[in-house]
């Protein structure tokens, strides 16, 4: 498909001249950021960004690649080096420590320097590193965490927790020896390490005692509370704050977000991770966009500003399943949340960053025609005389041999939301990838986001932009009209 | 491997504070660029950049990812959308048209708008688009093309040629019907379309009549001249310029580059593409770094400045073979050329861009330990109880079934320069990938390289920075001390 207007060189020359004009007009703001938002696309490498752009464009009846994601509109871009101290290819725990705390850690640890060792409780104390969210709170800002995973998951936990094992969601997940040594589960740390104004995502079951039925799935024992210590952490959290409210469904969330008496809001919408956007019950569970909007409504009441972490956390899960349909539809919802946040905030006073913690071994090749489905087949056949998809994985659960050969695939099969793209190597879960990821930036001090940087740089840019520790002597003018 | 200094948060905090300090000091230059250099890593997607960084670092006895490529030091980064008008995943012809001429074209066409159709000679005339190199020449600058492929290959051809078929290297490759319609082969266009001061790379055989023995392989008929029109294009080119010199080996190149009487230099060092860096005979063939240095020595004599295209063209070839060793060692040599050029030029007057035309379905996953070989095995075994490499391809010739199963692999096998990494789909040649690629920029107007852009933007930034057509009214101050 060749769009007739694109045949004319004037189309491209005009477009580029406009882009040049916009580039020339870019003026680095010399003011401080009142508000900080970090949008984290878990597993959203550059190949995911491009494929999602095409899909989002095609959902709007365009050919695809010529369209813009919300993140594409951010004026500044950098590349982020994601390795952890001990691994070339990292996990979401060590990376969260990097972009939220500004220090690199070890694989599967969270909020700890690399002096801490995975699963060794006694290496925790003294190695804690403090997140930018924590520093923002100490500076009088309101703070929030929004995710489509459980709120105790690795990425959001980087904002508030310190643990040698990212899998210690509730005390039931922590070995008795570690509990005795004083290591706390992540759910406990969520409510006790610091005062978080808004907590939205999944993860109900880690907050309640074993045997507590889940409100949404009361008859399903596997979805109920998991805690061994008998604590009701939601109750404990509510008791801490006069204006605290706990909600577990969409209706309650929308009500609470508009209620001026609510100062603190915890919304846990699933026992574990939230459902994929394509599986979401839209009456029961809010979308990431709705959670982001609710969080912004509450947080933006604070005249001193806010810090908000928003995670599209299940992009990663779709890729681990080698189900690109899930990964890409999650990316689109993540981008929709970015777009909505842009409408609800001003780039005059809000530094917004979009990045990924790491990539995936996910590729988009095969010379498909423009406008063809991102989930479709490459033109022609492979060496084995069978069709193949343009989307493929290096490794993962999509590897299958059928009668000792690679299975054939049709366009309707590959377009299915359940289809697993093929891989070179069979694994239970497709792995992360180690290449640099993009950082997109907009707002005060966004111009500092440049070149190729360590992932830790992200936390430092946020801290500097808002004049938080250790950059309180930032020498940035407050934005005209900001109140304190 | 955990470096002890990296266990200390101060290591990361200090490093990030330094990076912030450098970012704050960045001052967009308001001057014009006297010189333009575009370094094109053919097929050098972000996954290739990261893997090459690790390999280059490890060759210097470092762990790898913490080190810097020369391109990593460039202060500005953007992402480039590489699709062609007709394909989601492009080739090197359509992309060359984009980044060198500023207009997107169709797959496998070069220097033509998308009104031209692949292989249809009669769609050529009237659809030619003019490269920045051509515009630079018209503005009185010296211009050069350096590549490790044949100089008539798709990428360099984008600087000077207009053809509906990128494979029309010599007239022997052009169908008689197209020749009759007036379509010229690329080699002919190399010497006749415009005056190019420096031409260095491979591609001897396309310049000489059929039956002309090659000087390096005189007994190998397949390496001799291919032309049917009986023309000796080298002779024709030499006759055009008083100070023209033709060389075909390293010794002659080094001599010519230091000879002040040489005004024009053509060096063709292989009949076809140049040899991979790991196969190069260092007495006969120059490296890409040496060719770049020779080009700069000649071009920098012009007080009006120069335009130089430098291509690491065989990164792409290594990937097409699913031989990551070749692709990554080519990338390192490409980066070495960038480094050398940086030493020989000033960022005060030279805008240098580094980018790729497209990516490849090449991934780097599997959670390897820091410091482990980039060509090594992932920890643990796959579902089929066999080892697997951290580097893999989505598709390509590395797909093999042995007795109806995926072959096992050892560390020594995977470390071999001949080893083909496995892929999900068997193809004769691994394909390009469609995700955005990075653009690295340094020098005057480099700050315009920002955000997510169409690949065409690159040509426009170069033209604007040097006040070339259509931006002659660029309103940029010439650098203090520039001469005309």
């Amino acid at each position: 498909i060749i769009p007739v207007e694109e045949e004319n060189p004037d189309f491209w020359n005009r477009q580029a001249a406009e882009a040049l004009g916009a580039a020339k007009k870019l003026q680095p703001a010399q003011t401080a950021a009142k508000n900080l938002i970090i949008f984290l696309g878990d597993g959203m490498g550059v190949s995911t960004v491009t494929a999602a752009r095409i899909l989002k464009g095609q959902k709007k009846d365009k050919l695809g690649p010529e369209t813009f994601l919300a993140m594409d509109r951010f004026p500044y871009v950098a590349l982020s080096k994601t390795y952890s101290v001990d691994k070339h290819v990292p996990d979401s725990g060590a990376t969260a420590t990097a972009y939220l705390c500004g220090v690199k850690g070890n694989f599967q640890t969270i909020g700890l320097s690399a002096a801490a060792r995975f699963n060794q409780c006694n290496t925790t104390r003294g190695n804690e590193v403090i997140s930018v969210m924590n520093r923002a709170k100490k500076a009088g800002k309101s703070v929030g965490v929004v995710t489509t995973t459980r709120v105790q998951h690795a990425s959001p936990a980087g904002a508030y927790a310190h643990t040698v094992n990212r899998n210690w969601y509730s005390d039931a997940d922590v070995p008795a020896s570690a509990r005795q040594e004083g290591c706390q589960d992540i759910a406990t740390q969520l409510i006790s390490n610091m005062d978080i104004d808004v907590i939205l995502g999944g993860g109900r079951k880690y907050m309640f005692p074993m045997g507590t039925p889940d409100p949404e799935y009361p008859d399903d024992y596997s979805q109920g509370g998991t805690r061994l210590d008998g604590k009701n952490l939601v109750q404990e959290w509510l008791a801490k704050h006069q204006g605290a409210r706990y909600v577990w469904n969409r209706t309650e969330l929308l009500q609470a977000s508009l209620d001026p008496s609510v100062t603190h809001l915890m919304g846990l919408f699933e026992p574990g991770d939230m459902k994929y956007e394509i599986h979401r019950d839209s009456t029961l569970d809010p979308s990431l966009m709705e959670m982001t909007e609710a969080a912004l409504l509450l947080l933006s009441r604070n005249p001193r500003g806010f810090f908000l972490f928003v995670e599209g956390g299940r992009i990663d899960h779709g890729h681990h399943e080698s189900r690109a349909y899930r990964a890409l539809t999650e990316t689109i919802m993540f981008d929709d949340a970015i777009e909505r946040a842009g409408q609800l905030t001003s780039e005059e006073d809000t530094l917004s960053l979009v990045t990924a913690d790491h990539s995936h071994v996910f590729s988009f090749g095969g010379y498909p025609l423009r406008g063809s489905s991102i989930f479709g087949l490459a033109p022609g056949k492979a060496r084995d005389r069978k069709a193949y998809t343009v989307l493929l994985y290096g490794n993962g659960p999509g590897y299958v041999l059928k009668d000792g050969a690679r299975p054939d695939v049709t366009e309707s099969e590959s377009g299915s939301p359940e289809y697993r793209q093929q891989s070179a190597v069979p694994l239970d879960g497709e792995t992360h990838a180690g290449e640099d990821v993009a950082v997109f930036a907009r707002g005060p001090q966004a111009h500092l986001v440049h070149g190729v940087q360590e992932q830790t740089f992200i936390a430092h840019v946020m801290a500097f932009a808002a004049c938080l520790e250790p950059y309180t002597a930032c020498d940035l003018a407050p934005r005209a009209g900001t109140t304190d | 491997i955990i470096p002890v200094e990296e266990e200390n948060p101060d290591f990361w905090n200090r490093q990030a504070a330094e990076a912030l300090g450098a970012a704050k000091k960045l001052q967009p230059a308001q001057t014009a660029a006297k010189n333009l250099i575009i370094f094109l890593g053919d097929g050098m997607g972000v996954s290739t950049v990261t893997a090459a960084r690790i390999l280059k670092g490890q060759k210097k006895d470092k762990l790898g990812p913490e080190t810097f490529l020369a391109m990593d030091r460039f202060p500005y980064v953007a992402l480039s959308k590489t699709y062609s008008v007709d394909k989601h995943v492009p080739d090197s012809g359509a992309t060359a048209t984009a980044y060198l001429c500023g207009v997107k074209g169709n797959f496998q066409t070069i220097g033509l708008s998308a009104a031209a159709r692949f292989n249809q000679c009669n769609t050529t005339r009237g659809n030619e688009v003019i490269s920045v190199m051509n515009r630079a020449k018209k503005a009185g600058k010296s211009v050069g093309v350096v590549t490790t492929t044949r100089v008539q290959h798709a990428s360099p051809a984008g600087a000077y040629a207009h053809t509906v078929n990128r494979n029309w290297y010599s007239d022997a490759d052009v169908p008689a019907s197209a020749r009759q319609e007036g379509c010229q082969d690329i080699a002919t266009q190399l010497i006749s379309n415009m005056d190019i001061d420096v031409i260095l790379g491979g591609g001897r055989k396309y310049m000489f009549p059929m039956g002309t023995p090659d000087p390096e392989y005189p007994d190998d008929y397949s390496q001799g001249g291919t032309r049917l029109d009986g023309k000796n294009l080298v002779q024709e080119w030499l006759a055009k310029h008083q100070g023209a010199r033709y060389v075909w080996n390293r010794t002659e190149l080094l001599q010519a580059s230091l000879d002040p009487s040489v005004t024009h230099l053509m060096g063709l060092f292989e009949p076809g593409d140049m040899k991979y860096e790991i196969h190069r005979d260092s007495t006969l063939d120059p490296s890409l770094m040496e060719m770049t240095e020779a080009a700069l020595l000649l071009l920098s004599r012009n007080p009006r400045g120069f335009f130089l295209f430098v291509e690491g063209g065989r990164i792409d070839h290594g990937h097409h073979e699913s031989r990551a060793y070749r692709a990554l060692t080519e990338t390192i040599m490409f980066d070495d050329a960038i480094e050398r050029a940086g030493q020989l030029t000033s960022e005060e007057d030279t805008l240098s861009l580094v980018t790729a035309d497209h990516s490849h379905v090449f991934s780097f996953g599997g959670y390897p330990l820091r410091g482990s070989s980039i060509f090594g095995l992932a920890p643990g075994k796959a579902r089929d109880r066999k080892a697997y490499t951290v580097l893999l391809y989505g598709n390509g010739p590395g797909y093999v079934l042995k007795d109806g199963a995926r072959p096992d692999v050892t560390e020594s096998e995977s470390g071999s320069p001949e080893y083909r990494q496995q892929s999900a789909v068997p193809l004769d040649g691994e394909t390009h990938a469609g995700e955005d690629v990075a653009v690295f920029a340094r020098g005057p107007q480099a700050h315009l390289v920002h955000g997510v852009q169409e690949q065409t933007f690159i040509a426009h930034v170069m033209a604007f920075a040097a006040c070339l057509e259509p931006y002659t009214a660029c309103d940029l101050a010439p650098r203090a001390g520039t001469t005309d």
């Epitope: 956007e277 979401r280 399943e321 349909y325 659960p397 059928k402 939301p417 289809y419 069979p426 | -």
Partner: antibody
């Protein structure tokens, strides 16, 4: 409470057509995948057709045995699922169930079933 | 398409016996298997999903296990009310039922 009620079964001659309906209540109909499953006398359960939810564009899938003859569709305004059965054969005689998927552990298991409606194809 | 081979097709056991039914998939189904109990004249009832997760109200004597291509339903101590036909269902790639196992009391 999730409820699925099938209707439209009965006796039909070979070669003729029949449309089954399944009226759904107790959940947001547009958010769920719906399927038809049948059980022929003395035989096992056989999945026939699937229609996905709004988020995935209500795309459809069929088993090889009914592809081209049966069509699954839905009326979202009325929360009704349909199965249009054409060119019926005697071997299509079965109890036809409509079923709703639940997305446990990100799978799409058939968690809720109607009581079924009997279709007899006979001359 | 993924095929499911269920065995045995019928099984006679005594009350209190340990009963095992197996299903083998033609390809890896990534633990996306469910087990249904079917009694004549009633709708099939979901007992286990995602290999081993018991549905609410299902007695704990029922358990599921497996991975890759091989999966098992186990009744640790057979009770009279367990007499029924049991079906496995793969739902990794669309849906495929096993042929069923008819369970009888000796």
């Amino acid at each position: 409470e999730v409820q699925l009620v099938e209707s439209g079964g009965g006796l039909v001659q070979p070669g003729r057509s029949l449309r089954l309906s399944c009226t759904a209540s107790g959940f947001t109909f547009t958010d769920y995948y719906m399927s038809w499953v049948r059980q022929a006398p003395g035989k096992g359960l056989e999945w026939l057709a699937l229609i996905r939810n709004k988020a995935t564009g209500y795309t459809t899938e069929y088993s090889a045995s009914v592809k081209g003859r049966f069509t699954i569709s839905r009326d979202n305004s009325k929360s009704i699922l349909y199965l249009q059965m054409n060119s019926l054969k005697t071997e299509d005689t079965a109890v036809y169930y409509c079923a709703r998927a639940s997305f446990y552990y990100d799978g799409k298991v058939l968690a809720y079933w109607g009581q079924g409606t009997l279709v007899t194809v006979s001359s | 398409d993924t095929q499911m081979t269920q065995s045995p097709s019928s099984l006679s056991a005594s009350v209190g016996d340990r009963v095992t039914i197996t299903c083998k998939a033609s390809q890896d189904i990534n633990k996306y298997i469910a087990w249904f109990q079917y009694k004549t004249g009633k709708a099939p009832k979901l007992f286990i999903h995602y290999t081993s997760t018991l549905q609410p109200g299902v007695p704990s004597r029922f358990s599921g296990s497996g991975s890759g291509r091989d999966y098992t339903l186990t009744i640790s101590s057979l009770q009279p009310e367990d007499i029924a036909t049991y079906y496995c269902l793969q739902y990794d790639n669309l849906y495929t039922f096993g042929q069923g196992t008819k369970l009888e009391i000796k």
